[in-house]
């Protein structure tokens, strides 16, 4: 079990549940989006491979004052084994392309759903 009790439910949460909850939150963000997400803020694009959760957090944590993604940031921190702070890029190996937060969320969601369907929860 992965200990991800901080954002969803008390105590340890099965990895499949934690991933499902993250997917649900990203779905909610994309479906409830009316105005440009986070005022059209740009973030670093990431490689959706190993270390993806930390890289995603490192990218999104640099967006401040955007309540719509605060829960996502908290959830991602549960998947990342080390503490991440703004301006930290240890997992972001490639920093060459910036995309809007809305596109970042959509790309991340598609990938996470594929991982979930494949049964890759860790």
């Amino acid at each position: 079990l992965t200990c991800l009790g901080g954002f969803a439910s008390p105590g340890p949460v099965p990895p499949s549940t934690a991933l499902r909850e993250l997917i649900e939150e990203l779905v909610n963000i994309t479906q409830n989006q009316k105005a440009p997400l986070c005022n059209g803020s740009m973030v670093w694009s990431i490689n959706l491979t190993a270390g993806m959760y930390c890289a995603a957090l490192e990218s999104l944590i640099n967006v401040s004052g955007c309540s719509a993604i605060e829960k996502t940031q908290r959830m991602l921190s549960g998947f990342c084994p080390h503490k991440v702070s703004a301006g930290q890029f240890s997992s972001l190996h490639v920093r060459d392309t910036k995309i809007e937060v809305a596109q970042f969320v959509k790309d991340l969601l598609l990938h996470l759903k594929k991982l979930f369907r494949e049964g890759q929860f860790n």
């Epitope: 499949s16 549940t17 499902r20 997917i23 649900e24 779905v27 479906q31 759903k113 594929k114 979930f116 369907r117 494949e118 049964g119």
Partner: antibody
Framework: QVTLKESGPGILQPSQTLSLTCSFS??????????VDWIRQPSGKGLEWLAH???????RYNPALKSRLTISKDTSSSQVFLMLASVDTADTATYYC???????????????WGQGTSVTVSS | DIQMTQTASSLSASLGDRVTISCRAS??????LNWYQRKPDGTVKLLIF???KLHSGVPSRFSGSGSGTDYSLTIRNLEQEDIATYFC?????????FGGGTKLEIK
Amino acid sequence: QVTLKESGPGILQPSQTLSLTCSFSGFSLSTSDMGVDWIRQPSGKGLEWLAHIWWDDVKRYNPALKSRLTISKDTSSSQVFLMLASVDTADTATYYCARTVSSGYIYYAMDYWGQGTSVTVSS
Amino acid sequence: DIQMTQTASSLSASLGDRVTISCRASQDIRNYLNWYQRKPDGTVKLLIFYTSKLHSGVPSRFSGSGSGTDYSLTIRNLEQEDIATYFCQQGNTLPLTFGGGTKLEIK
């Protein structure tokens, strides 16, 4: 209009391989978020999920039968196939195929079902 | 695997009645609960998904509720065409599992 129809051998002998075909219309397995499941129901017993296949060829199986099951698809002919190896009398059942969609949350809800095809394993 | 239990294997009711069919999961399935109707001719239809969302074309007399491990399907103003067997199914965790079914009969 979404429709699915199962076809199979009807009767086969123990130790043979069961081959089932699900022919569908009204949707495409080349479309994102689409999937097809196989479910069976032995006479007088409950429904048992067997396997599913997604548009991008991701496949999942019921662990209890995984070693004997193979699911595949032919997108161009709108067909999904299920093979069950080394059948026994316990595999006698009505076999259904059904569509599932994963847009939004992944509900794993089968929204359209075929009429089912009866399979009897007998020596 | 998650076990799904429908305690009533059969229910008898009169036309116009309100009928409730219950389903219990062996662990929390977080509202990923779907309901199906199987008619005597073998036709299977999805009625409700994600606990309470009505599938397209399903009459509004059908409704679903529940959370955690306990869920229910309610049919208001029972009609003759509702005579069928009703199955619950959890969609939270693979392998997908079904309840044993509740056969609805007319008094």
